[in-house]
């Protein structure tokens, strides 16, 4: 009986010869738990595991801690892969994080972090980032040092307010800080002067809600 081949991330999928963009099943080593993730096999050499995507407002991102933990949405469209999977994955080896952004005027930009990982659930999936390059701002729009993850039912931010309730979506809020890629999706011509939109301050400022975002990870040595 042939051994079942499993892949922990899209880099492994790519290296196995599957070089077509699409949804693949990923499994962590020593685990039977499977997740479906979209793999970008074309951008910047391929092998990217998409951990977040916003593109049309079809999925509600104002979700609970548990939903952000296990993931939600549609891997072919808008989705969140899941904090638990990403935490476990990024603690097994060194990963880079690339955040690709689109505005409503046809511009695109990115932020690339040379080292990214999430702490465990016990530490509220705190984000850790190092080494920023890219075109979406010289300063990180994810506050440094990294913050704990907050959702509408888990207030771990540094604000007297509850950022996740007020700005909507789960995120690594500060007080409340320069970004929220899981904010409310606003269509074109309704996307300015929004407190609670999809924000990346050091590219588009505070009131601008973006058209599209993709967060993707790949092993640093790929």
């Amino acid at each position: 009986k042939g051994e079942q081949i499993s892949f922990r991330d899209c880099a492994e999928v790519f290296k196995s010869g599957h070089t077509t963009n699409g949804v693949y099943t990923l499994t962590l080593p020593n685990s039977t738990e499977e997740v479906k993730a979209y793999c970008d096999m074309e951008a910047g050499g391929g092998g990217w595991t998409i951990i977040q995507r916003r593109e049309d407002g079809s999925v509600d991102f104002q979700r609970t801690w548990k939903e952000y933990k296990v993931g939600f949405g549609n891997p072919s469209g808008e989705y969140w892969l899941g904090n638990e999977f990403v935490s476990q994955l990024t603690n097994q080896q060194r990963y880079v994080l690339k955040i690709h952004l689109k505005d409503w005027e046809g511009n695109e930009a990115y932020s690339l972090y040379e080292h990214f990982y999430l702490s465990s659930e016990e530490l509220n999936y705190r984000i850790h980032l190092k080494g920023l390059t890219g075109t979406a701002g010289k300063i990180s729009s994810i506050s440094q040092p990294g913050n704990d993850f907050s959702t509408k039912d888990a207030d771990n931010d540094k604000c007297i307010c509850k950022c996740s309730q007020m700005l909507t979506g789960g995120w690594w809020f500060d007080a409340c800080g320069p970004s929220n890629l899981n904010g409310m999706y606003y269509p074109q011509r309704q996307n300015t002067n929004k407190f609670n939109g999809i924000k990346w301050y050091y590219w588009k400022g505070s009131g601008y809600s973006l058209k599209g975002t993709t967060m993707m990870i790949r092993p640093a040595g790929f």
């Epitope: 007020m166 007080a175 407190f195 505070s206």
Partner: antibody, heavy 121, light 107 residues
Framework: QVQLVQSGAEVKKPGASVKVSCKAS????????MVWVRQAPGQGLEWMGY????????GYNQKFEGRVTMTTDTSTSTAYMELRSLRSDDTAVYYC??????????????WGQGTLVTVSS | DIQMTQSPSSVSASVGDRVTITCKAS??????VAWYQQKPGKAPKLLIY???TRDTGVPSRFSGSGSGTDFTLTISSLQPEDFATYYC?????????FGGGTKVEIK
């Protein structure tokens, strides 16, 4: 100490424009958004818009869209608010105020002394 | 726009009195409410933000409470310097809006 000092009173004719300045001192000018709020005689407060001195980004109250322009000069730590096509109901005291946060337009913790703009023929 | 309805529009009180001013938002503003004090011919002064947090240097006799749509500013023991107009302000959504003001006058 943190201070916002505004330009002096102005008298303008209907249809004209006015440009009010607001010079900041005692803090890093580009670290906080600046808002403009007006108050008609004996009336309440009305938010006109904000400017982010860090990147020049603006957000205006729709009521004033197309008639108001907010700018900054970071070299002199000065914010400006220009209101065009003035009408008699634009007669008010115009205040600049600093927001407590760069990333969001929250509450306003430091205010200028106000500039009275009178529109009269 | 979110309407902030303040009441009463004016109140006459004596030194030492407890004064309560209320503000009702036309929709949920969470705790994104500030209170300002304004004296004649002067700029407003921030008293309270995030509904209940006193700004630096604001006396403890001023307190704020509320969440959602109903907010209250309380002056526990009115002092001579507290006679002024008070405004609530929501900053939960654009455009930020203010209540109509409450004038606290000497009885």
């Amino acid at each position: 100490q943190v201070q916002l000092v505004q330009s002096g009173a102005e008298v303008k004719k209907p249809g004209a424009s006015v440009k009010v300045s607001c010079k900041a001192s005692g803090y890093s000018f580009t670290d906080y958004n600046m808002v403009w709020v007006r108050q008609a005689p004996g009336q309440g407060l009305e938010w006109m818009g904000y400017i982010d001195p860090y990147n020049g980004g603006t957000g205006y109250n729709q009521k004033f869209e197309g008639r108001v322009t907010m700018t900054t000069d970071t070299s002199t730590s000065t914010a400006y608010m220009e209101l065009r096509s003035l009408r008699s109901d634009d007669t008010a005291v115009y205040y600049c105020a600093r927001t407590r946060d760069r990333y969001d337009v929250w509450y306003f913790d430091v205010w200028g002394q106000g500039t009275l703009v009178t529109v009269s023929s | 726009d979110i309407q902030m309805t303040q009441s009463p529009s004016s109140v006459s009180a004596s030194v030492g009195d407890r004064v309560t001013i209320t503000c009702k938002a036309s929709q949920d503003v969470y705790i994104a409410v500030a209170w300002y004090q304004q004296k004649p011919g002067k700029a407003p002064k921030l008293l309270i933000y995030w509904a209940s947090t006193r700004d630096t240097g604001v006396p403890s006799r001023f307190s704020g409470s509320g969440s959602g749509t109903d907010f209250t500013l309380t002056i526990s023991s009115l002092q001579p310097e507290d006679f002024a107009t008070y405004y609530c302000h929501q900053y939960s959504s654009y455009p930020p809006t203010f209540g109509g003001g409450t004038k606290v006058e000497i009885k």
